[in-house]
């Protein structure tokens, strides 16, 4: 139509100045399009610059409606984590408070002259709880054999106890039971409290991770050309108003995203293993009943060891032989009276309750974000059209939008009418961030089924992706060298956030 | 064989810092307490504090609280102990020591690092 | 802080001889105290813990004895190499403190 060719370009000069561009590259009137290389070329109010522009533009657009997007579920993870994180230290802390309030009281000498024991323990249990490559167990069963060698010393100030006499005790303590079942339940109890606490949360800094990193995941040219097509070409050809047809853009979109995508069926189970695992926070092995609870056992533990002590000695001395005996020391140190006991099973706040049903529906609703995400982003950022179909921009004019729409992931997109996409190279990083979520995903179902796991040799998968296994801080990335259990007892390994402790010593 | 290396002597201006290493090897790094102790010239030995070496957790004497920082590399199995605001006095001998079993009684000793204060 | 208070600071005495140090803490230590030798030069090494267990590689002529306050270390027959400074210390309360030391000199 020769009149077309007069047309003005006054609505994309409007729109191209809005953007930050120099007004100096717009033509008065419509030119001739043969040298677009995206848009079809009619004629057109856009120069190879104005199109490289916008190119640019939308491709950046895009990535920052993306980031948005994940922000968004990012800033929820990380509350999440924020929340349960502090609800879990702050149970370990209060029974640590409460142990270093009652114990001196209770149990006197026999806890102030081994608190730095005590204090190590529950160091042990935060580092464990945040991730670090330590076994548990072996944690417990160390901290059982230096305070049995200790207070076996303190009870018998008058034997004389060599190294080869301690020795020979710790080889002793496991047929001798000198703290009675406490130590077998607590072991039993908070290997399961704690692996499902530190893999729920771990679980959260995994997904809150994997999102990070696949949100920085470039998009590549055959995306940039569609997304111009998409959304600027319509200004250039002289139909600034029409809006892009529903299904063209989610085609653009299920194109561009299509590697994305293909972490959903992993995502789903990430999320479903997550909710699963909080039924492990109730009952009586339960990690609000647990975790808060350690000193009780411990008490337990120490009462048993004074209950027991004459036939224990006795055992002992027929295992090792008779101790020499100080002549300057006293008689058997005298039988305190028990320590009294706080009650075990502690009353649940209400906090968890109100955490994991928040946490479950806030799970549930990300759940479908990487299918969804296509969809969420074309009906929130690209301003689609609600016009009739044959009134929206479908990539080459106004008009009704033909091709089907593609299914999800990236073998989907082998016949995808916008983007070219290359189905037998997929992208890397999202692969390695699959392969991360299966880890996780595995971790937690060990998780559920009361194991221990090894967290920093699980996630060796060899991808090298850096991605983060989750971990709170540093910990995990630090393999703490452990020596086998043996009688001479290794310290445990103590947290730094407690340090400089002044007062008694416990040596 | 348990053996603890300490760096060499060192000459500091009053007002300087001074960071001494010991290097451990022939045991578990991470499974005892080191120590810190100081000997002045002619005088007997002072506890500045102690360091778990799996994780940094410090305990220290209050008399060195304000200036002293303990710490440790595990990959390296060393651990270090920076004196700030230097002074006169803490002319000395400084020693690392390693607890002998959990007991607080040092068993292995470094050799010493002379630290000497002047102007 | 627990003090401890060594006497006598130092001791003139000839090979052969028997000498005891005594070690006096300001208040109740139980057993936890080490004794350590120092020659000249050296590091400390360590004697004695618990109060009265010698340590390996410590000649069977020292021996520790004592509980609570007062302890002693006692050289049954000084020898030319335990002509050095001798140190108790407590490990019962931090800050860990050391004796001021006993000099066992060549009479």
């Known amino acids: 139509d020769p009149a077309s060719k007069s047309r003005s370009c006054g609505e994309v000069r409007q729109i191209y100045g809005a953007k930050g561009f120099s007004l100096s590259d717009v033509p008065q009137a419509e030119i001739s399009g043969e040298h677009l290389r995206i848009c079809p070329q009619g004629y057109t109010c856009c120069t190879s610059e104005m199109e490289e522009n916008l190119a640019n533009r939308s491709h950046a657009e895009l990535e920052t409606a993306l980031r948005d997007s994940s922000r968004v579920l990012q800033a929820m993870l990380a509350t999440q984590l924020r929340s349960f994180d502090d609800h879990f230290q702050h149970l370990l802390n209060d029974s640590e408070r409460t142990l270093q309030a009652t114990f001196p009281g209770a149990f006197g000498e026999l806890y102030t002259q081994n608190a730095r024991a005590f204090r190590d323990l529950y160091s042990e249990l935060r580092l464990y709880y945040r991730g670090a490559n330590l076994h548990l167990e072996e944690t417990l069963a160390e901290f059982w054999a230096r305070l049995l060698e200790r207070l076996f010393k303190q009870l018998h100030p008058q034997l004389l106890l060599p190294d080869d006499y301690l020795d020979c005790l710790g080889k002793q303590a496991e047929a001798l039971r000198p703290f009675g079942e406490a130590p077998r339940e607590l072991r039993l109890r908070a290997t399961r409290a704690f692996v499902a606490a530190r893999s729920f949360v771990q679980g959260l800094g995994v997904a809150s991770d994997v999102v990070r990193k696949v949100a920085q995941v470039p998009l590549g040219p055959e995306c940039s050309r569609a997304v111009m097509k998409l959304v600027y070409c319509a200004h250039c050809l002289g139909v600034p108003g029409a809006r892009p047809c529903p299904d063209y853009c989610r085609n653009v979109l299920k194109g561009c995203l299509a590697n994305q995508a293909d972490l959903d069926a992993e995502w789903r189970n990430l999320l479903d293993s997550m909710v699963l695992i909080t039924d492990k926070f109730w009952g009586t092995s339960g990690v609000e009943s647990v975790i808060g609870s350690v000193h009780t056992w411990l008490a337990e533990a120490i009462n048993a060891l004074q209950d027991n002590r004459d036939t224990l000695t006795a055992k002992v001395i027929q295992g090792c032989g008779n101790p020499k005996v100080n002549p300057q020391g006293p008689g058997p140190e005298e039988k305190r009276r028990r320590g009294k006991l706080a009650p075990r099973e502690r009353p649940p706040s209400g906090t968890l309750e109100k955490l994991v049903s928040e946490a479950k529906a806030q799970l549930r609703d990300v759940q479908d974000f990487w299918i969804s995400l296509p969809g969420t982003l074309c009906s929130e950022k690209m301003a689609l059209s609600t016009a009739s179909d044959d009134r929206c921009w479908n990539g080459m004019a106004r008009g009704r939008y033909l091709p089907e729409v593609m299914g999800d992931g990236l073998a989907n997109q082998i016949n995808n009418p916008e983007v070219e996409v290359d189905i037998t190279k997929p992208d890397m990083t999202i692969r390695q961030q699959i392969m991360q979520l299966k880890i996780m995903t595995n971790r937690l179902r060990s998780a559920y089924n009361g194991n221990d796991v090894d967290f920093q040799d699980a996630s060796d998968d060899g991808s090298g992706s850096g991605s983060g296994d989750g971990c709170l801080d540093d910990l995990c990335s630090r393999k703490v060298s452990r020596k086998s259990s043996s009688s001479r007892t290794p310290l445990t390994h103590a947290l730094p956030g407690l340090s400089e402790q002044e007062g008694q010593k416990t040596s | 064989q348990v053996q603890l290396v300490q760096s060499g002597a060192e000459v500091k201006k009053p007002g300087a810092s001074v960071k001494v290493s010991c290097k451990a090897s022939?045991?578990?790094?991470?499974?005892?307490?080191m120590h810190w102790v100081r000997q002045a010239p002619g005088q007997g030995l002072e506890w500045m504090g102690e360091?778990?070496?799996?994780?940094?957790?410090?305990t220290y004497n209050q008399k060195f609280k304000a200036r002293v920082t303990m710490t440790r590399d595990t990959s390296t199995s060393t651990v270090y102990m920076e004196l700030s605001s230097l002074r006169s006095e803490d002319t000395a001998v400084y020693y690392c020591?390693?607890?002998?079993?959990?007991?607080?009684?040092?068993?292995?000793w470094g050799q010493g690092t002379l630290v000497t204060v002047s102007s | 802080d627990i003090v401890m208070t060594q006497s006598p600071s130092s001791v003139s005495a000839s090979v052969g001889d028997r000498v005891s140090i005594t070690c006096r803490a300001s208040?109740?230590?139980?057993?936890?105290l080490a004794w350590y030798q120092q020659i000249p030069g050296k590091a400390p090494r360590i004697l004695i813990s618990?109060?009265?267990i010698l340590q390996s590689g410590a000649p069977s002529r020292f021996s520790g004895s004592g509980f609570g306050t007062d302890f002693t270390l006692t050289i049954s027959s000084v020898q030319p190499e335990d002509f050095a400074t001798y140190y108790c210390?407590?490990?019962?309360?931090?800050?860990?403190?050391f004796g001021g030391g006993t000099k066992v000199e060549i009479k």
């Open positions: 020591a390693r607890e002998k079993r959990d007991d607080g009684v040092f068993a292995y």
């Open positions: 022939g045991y578990t790094f991470t499974g005892y307490y």
């Open positions: 360091i778990n070496p799996s994780t940094g957790d410090t």
């Open positions: 208040e109740h230590i139980n057993g936890w």
């Open positions: 618990s109060a009265s």
């Open positions: 210390q407590q490990a019962k309360s931090y800050p860990l403190t």
